[in-house]
Amino acid sequence: VPRWRQQWSGPGTTKRFPETVLARCVKYTEIHPEMRHVDCQSVWDAFKGAFISKHPCNITEEDYQPLMKLGTQTVPCNKILLWSRIKDLAHQFTQVQRDMFTLEDTLLGYLADDLTWCGEFNTSKINYQSCPDWRKDCSNNPVSVFWKTVSRRFAEAACDVVHVMLNGSRSKIFDKNSTFGSVEVHNLQPEKVQTLEAWVIHGGREDSRDLCQDPTIKELESIISKRNIQFSCKNIYRPDKFLQCVKNPEDSSCTSEI
């Protein structure tokens, strides 16, 4: 008799999840000399231990502590780039501006980027059929809790000027329910972080509006300033030119507003 399996609303664990995590770990530690000491098998064991045999709606940050410990990494605290709903451009930027880091440029972020995973209560199986959806099923699922945990730690580590890339094409440029809005904003440490600088990325070629005047940006400004962190906002009118100018800052066209 086939065993009854919980049907969740979200997609199941990414195919070849264990192999992917292990392969990414090996690749990352080869590319980043400061992480060469990391034992990728231990990393996988700790990752697996966070969610295997546990109810996928009952995961806690505590479950991920062994993994967090193994993945401890020091990035320059004044070179942190956060992002919300504009991951691709943020990653393109840090690929060019190599001294700046998104969460996905760290080992733990790199391991889990774009992956889904969950297990089942009381069995050692990985569920490849379905996993809990944050909205429809539960928020304390393995993926959400992982990102909440690593995002909190990443924000807590930041200092001086922290940059955040925001998507100016969305109806809510700053969304209080995003990981940035619900986790990172509230875990920046005022004792270390002087200023949060928002880069609002424009979508349309002819869009010359000042999106720093958007009500959601003013809401972000209010939240940040109440936490005794200063706020700055800049429009990036031409993201393509912005990236080009990061690559070639000497270009004569890069002196004007981007």
Partner: antibody, heavy 119, light 107 residues
Framework: QVQLVESGGGVVQPGRSLRLSCAAS????????VHWVRQAPGKGLEWVAV???????DYSAAFMSRFTISKDNSKNTVYLQMNSLRAEDTAVYYC?????????????WGQGTLVTVSS | DIQMTQSPSSLSASVGDRVTITCKSS??????LAWYQQKPGKAPKLLIY???SLETGVPSRFSGSGSGTDFTLTISSLQPEDVATYYC?????????FGQGTKVEIK
């Protein structure tokens, strides 16, 4: 270029009121905050108040009951309304622009306007 | 209110000398400190913010250091145009408060 010009200073009797103006050019008040800072003759700098781009304000407690900061975005001008003036309010009053959207230090200052409170 | 205490209140040094001005806060202000230069009859000019960051256009002979409660402004090689009064300002808490100033003169 970015510039701030204060006006409205002069000699005023104790107990009277005065309104100072700070005309901004080269930048928009919808993007930056503006502080008022004063300096009594031969003395140091003393912070009075700030008005942020959205119109919210912060004051030094010493001035909150008598001074009001406001702005008119259409005129790109910030004001400081000073009531119940005293001899110790005699000072040069500077307005100064924040370096970024909402920061507490200033990169561009006006030339100052002298207020003398005397009978 | 946070008290800011500068020392010395005045100093006289020769052109080319290294000049150091200190600023102490009455409580921890982390790195929320700015330094301004004010020449006689003129408005203040921002030199340093965030305790250590040099404002654009300010000569590199000016530098700031410190965090917590003890801060220093250093002029590595004093120039005649550096004759002025220098003020520190904390912006950790309102009201914003300034040091009483340090007057720098040329011998």
């Amino acid at each position: 270029q970015v510039q701030l010009v204060e006006s409205g200073g002069g000699v005023v009797q104790p107990g009277r009121s005065l309104r100072l103006s700070c005309a901004a050019s080269g930048f928009s008040l919808t993007n930056y905050g503006v502080h008022w800072v004063r300096q009594a003759p031969g003395k140091g700098l003393e912070w009075v108040a700030v008005i942020w781009r959205g119109g919210s304000t912060d004051y030094s407690a010493a001035f909150m009951s008598r001074f009001t900061i406001s702005k008119d975005n259409s005129k790109n001008t910030v004001y400081l309304q000073m009531n119940s003036l005293r001899a110790e309010d005699t000072a040069v009053y500077y307005c100064a622009k924040t370096t970024l959207t909402r920061v507490w230090y200033c990169d561009v200052w006006g030339q100052g306007t002298l207020v003398t409170v005397s009978s | 209110d946070i008290q800011m205490t500068q020392s010395p209140s005045s100093l006289s040094a020769s052109v080319g000398d290294r000049v150091t001005i200190t600023c102490k806060s009455s409580e921890d202000i982390y790195n929320r400190l700015a330094w301004y230069q004010q020449k006689p009859g003129k408005a203040p000019k921002l030199l340093i913010y965030g305790a250590t960051s040099l404002e654009t256009g300010v000569p590199s002979r000016f530098s700031g250091s410190g965090s917590g409660t003890d801060f220093t402004l250093t002029i590595s090689s004093l120039q005649p145009e550096d004759v002025a009064t220098y003020y520190c300002q904390q912006y950790w808490n309102t009201p914003l408060t300034f040091g009483q100033g340090t007057k720098v003169e040329i011998k």
